[in-house]
Each structure stands twice: as C-alpha cells, then as structure tokens.
Interface confidence: low
C-alpha cells in the first residue's frame, strides 16, 4: 500500500538533544517497524511545537522522569 | 476570558498494568497540568486501541525499554 | 536557545499524499514559525504510526472532513 | 481482558468558540471512537495552554486556514 512506501519512512529525520525538560508537555515513543528501522522519540513543547529527540543521548530518561513527576 | 471555557480533563479514567509490551506500538507520556492533576501514560496497541497504563513503576520502564530496542 | 537551533527546523522533512483517510485517527496542524517556515500536517494512524501529509495535495481537507464526521 | 480497564474518555469537557486564531500555534483534530462519541478539536495556544474548540462553530475552518497559511 502507498502508506508503506519509501516516502513515509521515519518521521524523525533530524534529532536534537538540546532541549529543556521543563519545556516539554508530552513525549511519544514510537516503536521501530517496517516504516522506520529505528524507534522515535517525539516531544511536544509547551508552544505546541514538536521535535525529535536523540535516542543516543541519555536526556530522554530525564525527560520521562520529569514528565511523570506530578 | 471565554477561552477559559474550553476546558480539558484527564484522558485516563481507569488504568491497567496488565498489558503485554509486545502489543504496544507507541507510548505517550503526558505531563500533569491544569487540565489533569496526574501524569498520564497512554499506549497505542497494534490493533489501534489506546489504553492508559498504571503509573506504578516499573512496568512502563520495561515497555519504554522494549519500544526503544530496535 | 539551543532548542531554536537549525537542527530542529521542521519535523516534517518528507511528506506523503498517499494515505487512506479511514486509517487516520487524528491530525495535527502545526503553524509555521521561527522553527519551521511552512505549516506542518501530522497524521496519526490507527497503529500509532505518525506521518506527514503533503500540504499541496487537497487530500488533507477530505481527511479533516472525515475526522470531524462522527 | 485486563487491558480493558485502561479506558480513555473524551479530553474535551467544555468547548469554546471564543478564541483568537492568531493565538493558536497548533490544532489537533481527533476522530470520534470507542473512547469518545464525538470528534474533538484541541488548540494549543502560544502560552502553552490547550483548549477545546466548538465543532458547531465555523471558526475552526478559519483557524485551520490561518494555520496553513505560511
């Protein structure tokens, strides 16, 4: 199906590890699959912007911890 | 302001801790905020269903670990 | 701030217009801004996957219409 | 199955049609489903707040149009 085509691949082509955890309101972890060979971490910032986080940087653990602290 | 009318609430009414990590394709961590006093963990299953996970550790850590393993 | 750096730019580098509206559960429209010169349309599929839609294709209007029909 | 416990509900309790399009940075259209009988329109404002928009008001079309204008 066309949804599976090479066009779709990964949503995250560029990633960053430069983000302040307190600016993040939610984080989505998307499993690797036929559409994308690597897992993806997409953060939503307070202003509604979305960014992809670097999986190699240990930052995401800190972010998840911070998000879960109520 | 009238914008105040458009209130959100928690998405998660009930939570479960019995979910098989391998059934999950993505996981969203939503920070607590004015709309909801507790952080929320929403998993999307392979069949497209969304469920709320119990924040009690460490199941979600296991799930995140599994999702990130490519 | 580093979050504003060129690395972040647009989340959607690749887009598709080949997607079945019925496979989509939600659609996010992100306004253009300093981080990204064009608006972005991100669709979430039933299986939790996310894809970027082509803004030039009139398909997204059909998708929005379909999503709003309850 | 115990997974059934993790129910979601509608995010939007109240909606508003009183919102200035220029205050909105992103808009999410969520399809109705088992978790919620009606489609939902959630706007993220510049200040990071999220509000639910009234689906009956034609305003959202104007907002989407404005968001997509780069």
């Amino acid at each position: 199906e066309a949804e599976e085509d090479g066009d779709l691949q990964c949503l995250c082509v560029k990633t960053t590890s430069q983000v302040r955890p307190r600016h993040i309101t939610s984080l989505e972890v998307i499993k690797a699959g036929p559409h994308c060979p690597t897992a993806q971490l997409i953060a939503t910032l307070k202003n509604g912007r979305k960014i992809c986080l670097d999986l190699q940087a240990p930052l995401y653990k800190k972010i998840i911890k911070k998000l879960l602290e109520s | 302001e009238a914008e105040e009318d458009g209130d959100l609430q928690c998405l998660c009414v009930k939570t479960t801790s019995q979910v098989r990590p391998r059934h999950i394709t993505s996981l969203e961590v939503i920070k607590a905020g004015p709309h909801c006093p507790t952080a929320q963990l929403i998993a999307t299953l392979k069949n497209g269903r969304k469920i709320c996970l119990d924040l009690q550790a460490p199941l979600y850590k296991k799930i995140i670990k599994k999702l990130l393993e490519s | 701030e580093a979050e504003e750096d060129g690395d972040l730019q647009c989340l959607c580098v690749k887009t598709t217009s080949q997607v079945r509206p019925r496979h989509i559960t939600s659609l996010e429209v992100i306004k253009a801004g300093p981080h990204c010169p064009t608006a972005q349309l991100i669709a979430t599929l039933k299986n939790g996957r996310k894809i970027c839609l082509d803004l030039q294709a009139p398909l997204y209007k059909k998708i929005i219409k379909k999503l709003l029909e309850s | 199955e115990a997974e059934e416990d993790g129910d979601l509900q509608c995010l939007c309790v109240k909606t508003t049609s009183q919102v200035r399009p220029r205050h909105i940075t992103s808009l999410e259209v969520i399809k109705a489903g088992p978790h919620c009988p009606t489609a939902q329109l959630i706007a993220t404002l510049k200040n990071g707040r999220k509000i639910c928009l009234d689906l009956q008001a034609p305003l959202y079309k104007k907002i989407i149009k404005k968001l997509l204008e780069s």
């Epitope: - | 479960t16 801790s17 507790t38 924040l55 550790a57 199941l59 979600y60 | - | -």
Partner: antibody, heavy 115, light 112 residues
C-alpha cells in the same frame, strides 16, 4: 509502611472488615493486595485493588471477599466468614504495577472463625 | 493456574547450595513475572527476587533466580544459618484467564 487491624474472634456468618492503613506512600500511586495464611499453611493471594480502584480477586475468593479503599486505607470485607477463613491476613504493596512482587508487607492480623 | 514447588522440604549444610524449583501450569504473564519470598515464623514474607531474576533491594547476592515461561529456579549458594525459613514462589498470570496472582505451596529449608 502498612498495618492491618480488625482481626478478632468471630462466629461464622457475621461479616467482618479488616483495614490496612498505609503511610509513607500514596494509594494513588500503588496498588495494594491482600494475602492470607492459615495456621501452618502456605500463602494465598486473595485480591488486589489498583490505583484506579479496579479490583481483581482469586477465583476462590470471588463473592466471599470485597476490597475497597479510601485515600489512606484499604479494606477487606469478609462477607460471610466460615471456619476455613481462620488465618493471618496480610496486606501488601506491589514493588511495581504488577499483581505480584510485594515488597512491603504489614505484620498481619489474625482472624479466628469459631462457633 | 497452579505453581508447583519442589521439594516441599530440603536440608542443607552451612556453606552448601540449595535449589528450589517452581513450575507453572501455564506460561506466566510476560514470561518472567515470577517472585520469590522468604518467610520466617511469626513474620510476614520478605521479597527476595522479582521478574524471575532481579534481586530485591537489600537482598544478598547468594540468592539467585532464573527461568522463564513455566520453569523457574531459586538457588541459594553459600547457605547460612539465617537462611533457615520457608520459601515461596509467586507468579503473575493473565487476569483475563483466571487468577492474576498465585503462590506456590512453599519449601521449608532446614540448615544443619
């Protein structure tokens, strides 16, 4: 910590409620289970109440026991005690979100059912 | 769902090794959701191992858990007098097909 109370000598048939009082953690973050141990016997899982008040019971315990909670206590109601319900009753907190691996236990409270 | 523990009783010399088996009648939830406890007379149980092989906080490394699916083992090496107690395995099963949680029948360890 956890502490059970309410254990006593009862006659068969009269309902009995045991209370588990928690301190040092929140019931909005952890589930609590009830486990019992008859004299000289092994451990038996009775049931669990989760963060979101979902309850799960052992098949043998359904209808015989009811678990409920407030913000700081978890109650176990024995609907109609029989002599087989004579045991020490423990409440326990899960290490995680599972229905097993209980890392914090109360000291137990003894229930004796006798006519 | 049943967890069968063997043997029901075992004797060991100080410094020796004890092996306790726990067999599940069907595969555990997520394959490894099994815990081991130690219980001494008049006391509540103490968690030793969870997730089949993870050591609980403060538990000496001479306690070792292994196994997956339906077969699990608790090994106590370099047995000490303080290890004399009853040991129980506890498994988590799929709640939708019966009991969420089940304990094994127990194994009494006597240290000579």
């Amino acid at each position: 910590s956890l502490e059970e109370s309410g254990g006593r000598l009862v006659t068969p048939g009269g309902p009995l409620t045991l209370t588990c009082t928690v301190s040092g953690f929140s019931l909005s973050s952890y589930g609590v289970s009830w486990v019992r141990q008859a004299p000289g016997e092994g451990l038996e899982w009775i049931g669990t109440i989760t963060v979101s008040r979902n309850t799960y019971y052992a098949s043998w315990a359904k209808g015989r026991f009811t678990i409920s909670k407030t913000s700081t206590t978890v109650d176990l109601r024995i609907t109609s005690p029989t002599t087989e319900d004579t045991a020490t009753y423990f409440c326990a907190r899960s290490l995680s979100s599972y229905y097993y691996a209980f890392n914090i236990w109360g000291p137990g409270t003894l229930v004796t059912v006798s006519s | 769902q049943v967890l069968t523990q063997t043997p029901s009783s075992v004797s060991a010399a100080v410094g020796g090794t004890v092996t306790i088996n726990c067999q599940a009648s069907q595969s555990l939830y997520d394959e490894k959701n099994l815990a081991w406890y130690q219980q001494k007379p008049g006391q509540p149980p103490k968690l030793l191992i969870y997730d089949a092989s993870d050591l609980a906080s403060g538990v000496p490394s001479r306690f070792k858990g292994s196994g997956s699916g339906t077969q699990f083992i608790l090994t106590i090496s370099g047995v000490q007098c303080d290890d004399a107690a009853s040991y129980y395995c506890q498994g988590e099963f799929d709640c939708s097909s019966g009991d969420c949680s089940v304990f094994g029948g127990g194994t009494e360890v006597v240290v000579e």
